[in-house]
């Protein structure tokens, strides 16, 4: 851009800054000529420690540039983010954070397994940490669900002691009435509709506990809830079809062996779920003693035919449709195995051989007046039924 | 012309988190420059908090940087302040200013009482 | 952290006089420092850049200079107006670091 003002003196040579250039090159520079300094991919602008995104000076009057030079250095992307549940490892060298530069990041071994793109990130130019997905974001330490110390299946009312570790993902619920849930993730529990109904306006009054054996015990990690979720196609008092609700909580659970949650159903979970599979109820429902139990206690129960707890609820005084499609039942012909009062909203979880994790099949729901009757059944809320429900309240939630 | 507006709370209680917006009218944060906020204390020392760049990359005084957190809206060509767990050594005056402080907006005050 | 010292707190001057303000950084920042106005209830006005470079719109009775740790704030014919109290800060590196204010004041 030449404008001859042979009046005016010319301006110093622009001396391109190291990693930059110089636009356009002249042979000499007068009054009103500019030149713009174009920086190596991988560096930037810089005036000190102030990003600028372009650069152009112009040549005055007095032979002098109006914008000092500014350097060109090279893109710092800065320390990462840290992880929840997880750790970053420096990959290019100790503390390395320029341009290229290559991260690692990883979760807490057994109890967290990463989500979205596998934790290696790259100093890029535009200086943001990039997966090579492309993602800006961090990468998610997911807690691993379904661990348990129980390897198998199969072999409460009628029910055994639970030892540590055996139902990781056994919550108390106390606030109103004495009730259970199961963790999801970190900080989500599911549970039955009807037991935290009265409290679905008032989250916070709920009490939760969970990483302990003993009701009682003094020794458990507390967490308080945000909000309720309460199926809208359930109807307090009238039936117990769509018996299921979600409790967000208000801050994330760290994962151990004695807190871990339990999976949701895959699609294939049918398979592990047909009449005679065996299922695992835990809670500190009431004993056959009529008691509520002072340590967990587990049930391991065959899947019911549909058709014949269908009918063995269709007597007085159960209305008709007591059993819906939305409902699983368990327990034995002859009785002696249940859950009961107390034990409501806690999970029925079956193994899936293939993963060897165990999963939620059913929520304690209802069942006869008189736990552990025979030709009469437990019955479940059949949360493969609801999977798309709870999938849509988590991502929104 | 450009201008930048600051606007908040005016009282917040110990430990509760502050939000600050910087609203800039006559030129778009993401154009260029850095866009900091400064806090001034009453006896007129003054401070720099950090910076949002034009690209979105931001930088933070260490002293705050585990409880700052500097975001933007591009389309209402705002940028915010966060700062977690406040205590009464946050009572201070907060601006917002573009690069090394060409244009500063008027500032808002902030009391941090219980 | 790069400190900025402004060792006078306090500069009386009159009107026509011409007052240097000086600043001294703790390391070495370059020409990255910057000056600024500020009058009571008022935000604060950038006046030079760069150590030497005027802001537009500045009197040109404004001057500044320096490198490296030592700067200085030159007002050659002081105006009423030019009472007020003036900041160095330094923008070479992170944290960016206010000097602690001198304040000019008429004798």
């Known amino acids: 851009h030449h404008h001859h003002h042979h009046a005016s003196q010319p301006c110093p040579y622009p001396m391109a800054p190291p990693n930059g250039h110089v636009s356009p090159v002249q042979a000499k520079y007068i009054l009103k000529d500019s030149f713009s300094i174009f920086c190596e991919t991988g560096y930037e602008l810089l005036q000190g420690h102030l990003p600028l995104k372009s650069f152009t000076a112009v040549c005055q009057k007095d032979g002098s540039w109006d914008r000092p030079m500014p350097a060109c250095s090279i893109v710092d992307c800065g320390p990462p983010d840290d992880l929840p549940s997880g750790r970053v490892e420096y990959i290019t060298g100790p503390g390395v954070t320029t341009y290229k530069a290559v991260i690692q990041y990883s979760c807490e071994e057994t109890f967290y397994t990463m989500k979205v793109n596998d934790g290696k990130y790259v100093c890029e130019a535009d200086g943001f940490w990039t997966s090579s997905k492309g993602e800006k974001s961090l990468p998610v330490c997911e807690p691993v669900c379904g661990l348990s110390a129980r390897t198998t299946g199969g072999r409460i009312y009628g029910g055994q002691k639970a030892k540590p570790g055996d139902f990781p993902w056994q919550v108390l619920i106390l606030g109103g009435t004495t009730a259970a849930g199961a963790l999801l993730y970190d900080n989500w529990v599911l549970t039955a509709a009807h037991a935290v109904y009265e409290q679905k306006h008032d989250a916070s009054a709920l009490d939760i506990r969970m990483g302990t054996l003993k009701r009682l015990s003094p020794h458990y990690t507390q967490a308080w809830s945000e909000a309720v979720f309460i199926h809208e196609g359930y109807t307090h008092d009238a039936g117990f079809d769509n018996d299921i609700a979600l409790i967000k909580l208000n801050n994330k659970v760290v994962i151990n062996s004695n807190i871990t949650p339990i999976c949701l159903p895959r699609k294939e979970a049918e398979s592990f779920m047909r009449t005679d599979d065996i299922g695992t109820a835990s809670g500190w429902g009431l004993t056959q003693r009529g008691f509520l139990a002072r340590n967990l206690m587990y049930v391991d129960i065959p899947i019911v035919d549909h058709q014949k707890c269908t009918a063995a609820y269709e007597k007085p005084p159960y209305p008709r449709g007591s059993v819906t499609a939305n409902m699983l039942c368990a327990g034995l012909e002859s009785g002696g195995k249940d859950s009961c009062r107390g034990d409501a909203g806690g999970a029925l979880v079956f193994l899936d051989s293939e993963t060897e994790r165990w999963f939620v099949g059913g929520i304690v729901s209802w069942g006869s007046m008189n736990c552990g009757e025979a030709g009469q059944y437990g019955v479940y809320t059949k949360v493969i039924n609801y999977i798309p429900w709870i999938e849509n309240i988590i991502s929104d939630f | 012309d450009v201008q930048l507006q600051e606007s908040g709370p005016g009282l917040v209680k110990p430990s509760q988190s502050l939000s600050l917006t910087c609203t800039v009218t006559g030129y778009s944060i993401t154009s260029d420059y850095a866009w900091n906020w400064i806090r001034q204390f009453s006896g007129d020392k003054l401070e720099w908090m950090g910076y949002i760049s034009y690209s979105g990359s931001t930088s933070y005084n260490p002293s705050l940087k585990s409880r700052i957190s500097i975001t933007r809206d591009t389309s209402k060509n705002q940028f915010f302040l966060h700062l977690s767990s406040v205590t009464t050594e946050d009572t201070a005056t907060y601006f917002c200013?573009?690069?090394?402080?060409?244009?500063w907006g008027h500032g808002t005050t902030l009391t941090v009482s219980s | 952290d790069s400190v900025m010292t402004q060792s006078q707190k306090f500069m009386s001057t009159s009107v026509g006089d011409r007052v240097s303000v000086t600043c001294k950084a703790s390391h070495n920042v370059g020409t990255n420092v910057a000056w600024f106005q500020q009058k009571p209830g008022q935000s604060p006005k950038g006046l030079i850049y760069?150590?030497?470079y005027r802001s537009s719109g500045v009197p040109d009775r404004f001057t500044g200079s320096g490198s490296g740790t030592d700067f200085t704030l030159t007002i050659s014919n002081v105006q009423s107006e030019d009472l007020a109290e003036y900041f160095c800060l330094q923008y070479n590196s992170n944290p960016l670091t206010f000097g602690g204010g001198t304040k000019l004041e008429v004798k």
């Open positions: 200013a573009r690069y090394w402080g060409d244009y």
């Open positions: 760069s150590a030497s």
